[in-house]
């Protein structure tokens, strides 16, 4: 796997341990927590990042679930099980044998159950809505300039192909970024929208996952764009399965 050869670090994931023990003395980096080898030329999967984060735990965060089929990460941090490719396993269980099914971004999509719970497949999150509120500014940002800046950011910083940024909406002070990526659209080597959204979320919170790169400095025509609130909604290819009790809560 590629990494910065001169000082053997992983530019795209600071939560790694790197050493020149790859083929031909090449730099090889392994994710903390899982020990899995990571490709430092692209984003690391959210599952491996969460696992690494749990090996050095911080305060869990809680978000609000907004609507019927859109999921929000209400459960905060957990230590996930990842498959050999670094994706979330469809079924996740905690140390007390409580299990639940997750989608491809690791967000719970069923009620919690016991070890008998079956999760037949990993359901893909094909639509992510990132809802931001920016701090007050002298005037509204120019919509086209803001739209282009956010599209550029996802291309350049997260290596997300421009075709996966479906839309950028703006009604001051609310910005919405829509990411869409169906299973059929995602080619080998394409960054997953879930991974890009997670890196963006961490950047916005001032917790950049990149090694040796400055934090996110978002500017629109030189004017700083400072985000004061972020909500991320996840829509799956198959709607989630929660009991009526939860839906009416």
């Amino acid at each position: 796997h590629t990494a910065a050869q001169d000082n053997c670090t992983c530019p795209t994931n600071k939560m790694t341990v790197c050493s020149p023990d790859g083929p031909g003395g090449r730099c090889q980096c392994r994710a903390l927590g899982s020990g899995m080898a990571v490709d430092c030329s692209t984003l690391t999967s959210k599952c491996l990042l969460l696992k690494a984060r749990m090996s050095a735990p911080k305060n869990a965060r809680t978000l609000v679930r907004p609507s019927e089929h859109a999921l929000v990460d209400n459960d905060g941090l957990y230590d996930p099980d990842c498959d050999p490719e670094g994706r979330f396993k469809a079924r996740q269980c905690n140390q007390t044998s409580v299990c639940w099914c997750v989608n491809s971004v690791g967000v719970r999509r069923t009620d919690k159950g016991d070890l008998s719970l079956r999760c037949d497949e990993l359901v893909r999150t094909h639509h992510i809505l990132i809802d931001l509120r920016h701090r007050p500014t002298a005037g509204a940002f120019n919509h086209s300039d803001l739209d282009a800046e956010l599209r550029r950011l996802f291309r350049e910083r997260y290596r997300l192909h421009p075709k996966f940024v479906a839309a950028v909406h703006y009604e001051q002070p609310t910005i919405q970024i829509e990411l869409r990526q169906n299973t059929s659209q995602k080619a080998a080597g394409d960054v997953d929208i879930g991974d890009a959204a997670y890196y963006f979320e961490r950047d916005i919170k001032g917790e950049s996952l990149f090694q040796g790169r400055g934090g996110l400095d978002l500017r629109v025509r030189g004017e700083p764009l400072q985000v004061e609130r972020t909500l991320i909604y996840y829509l799956d290819e198959i709607p989630p399965k929660f009991s009526m009790k939860r839906l009416t809560a």
């Epitope: 739209d147 599209r151 350049e156 075709k163 790169r213 400095d217």
Partner: antibody, heavy 117, light 106 residues
Framework: EVQLVQSGPEVKKPGASVKVSCKAS????????IGWVRQAPGQGLEWIGE????????YYTEKFKGRVTMTADTSTSTAYMELSSLRSEDTAVYYC??????????WGQGTLVTVSS | DIQLTQSPSSLSASVGDRVTITCSAS?????MYWYQQKPGKAPKLLIY???TLASGVPSRFSGSGSGTDFTLTISSLQPEDFATYYC?????????FGQGTKLEIK
């Protein structure tokens, strides 16, 4: 095979406008970005701006804002760059280039625009 | 705007020589891109992400650096390498290029 084929050379008078075309083939047009770069004779490369072909989102550099218009016709997979109020210093080769997760991965052959009275 | 300054502006070298071109950014950038341009032709992507060779680019080309200082190296010059080389950033709008380094035959 990815190809960007640009329109032919143009000679314009100061104050006039020029519209350069860039016809794309070999890829899904609306999935990408087309950027425009110019190069004055014997000089370096200067970025003008870019258009996101799927959404129509455009970013122009401050220097060209108000004078440049970028458009795209998805039915013919053609991008256009129009520059108005031409002056002699706009004499240059204008390139279109495709953008993806790279700023420019494939380039057109260039269009020479000469501004002369 | 991020300014990119290439050094040297021009360079005379012989076939087989090792050549190094540097690019200095006025503020930190994520990655650097390098292009090769021959007279009358469009630029061609040579190196992306500071150090990764674009498809079909010979291994005698290499790139390194991070932050504000980047380098393009040609380990053993070949006749077809005599051209002008540009660095370019897109870490922020507007995208900017270095002024170019013209590599000539000695």
């Amino acid at each position: 095979e990815v190809q960007l084929v640009q329109s032919g050379p143009e000679v314009k008078k100061p104050g006039a406008s020029v519209k350069v075309s860039c016809k794309a083939s070999g890829f899904t047009f609306t999935d990408y970005v087309i950027g425009w770069v110019r190069q004055a004779p014997g000089q370096g490369l200067e970025w003008i701006g870019e258009i996101y072909l799927g959404s129509g989102t455009i970013y122009y550099t401050e220097k060209f804002k108000g004078r440049v218009t970028m458009t795209a016709d998805t039915s013919t997979s053609t991008a256009y760059m129009e520059l108005s109020s031409l002056r002699s210093e706009d004499t240059a080769v204008y390139y279109c280039a495709r953008g993806s997760i790279f700023p420019f991965d494939y380039w057109g052959q260039g269009t020479l625009v000469t501004v002369s009275s | 705007d991020i300014q990119l300054t290439q050094s040297p502006s021009s360079l005379s070298a012989s076939v087989g020589d090792r050549v190094t071109i540097t690019c200095s950014a006025s503020s930190s950038v994520s990655y650097m891109y390098w292009y090769q341009q021959k007279p009358g032709k469009a630029p061609k992507l040579l190196i992306y992400d500071a150090s990764t060779l674009a498809s079909g680019v010979p291994s005698r080309f290499s790139g390194s650096g991070s932050g504000t200082d980047f380098t393009l190296t040609i380990s053993s010059l070949q006749p077809e390498d005599f051209a002008t080389y540009y660095c370019q950033q897109w870490s922020s709008y507007p995208y900017t290029f270095g002024q170019g380094t013209k590599l000539e035959i000695k």
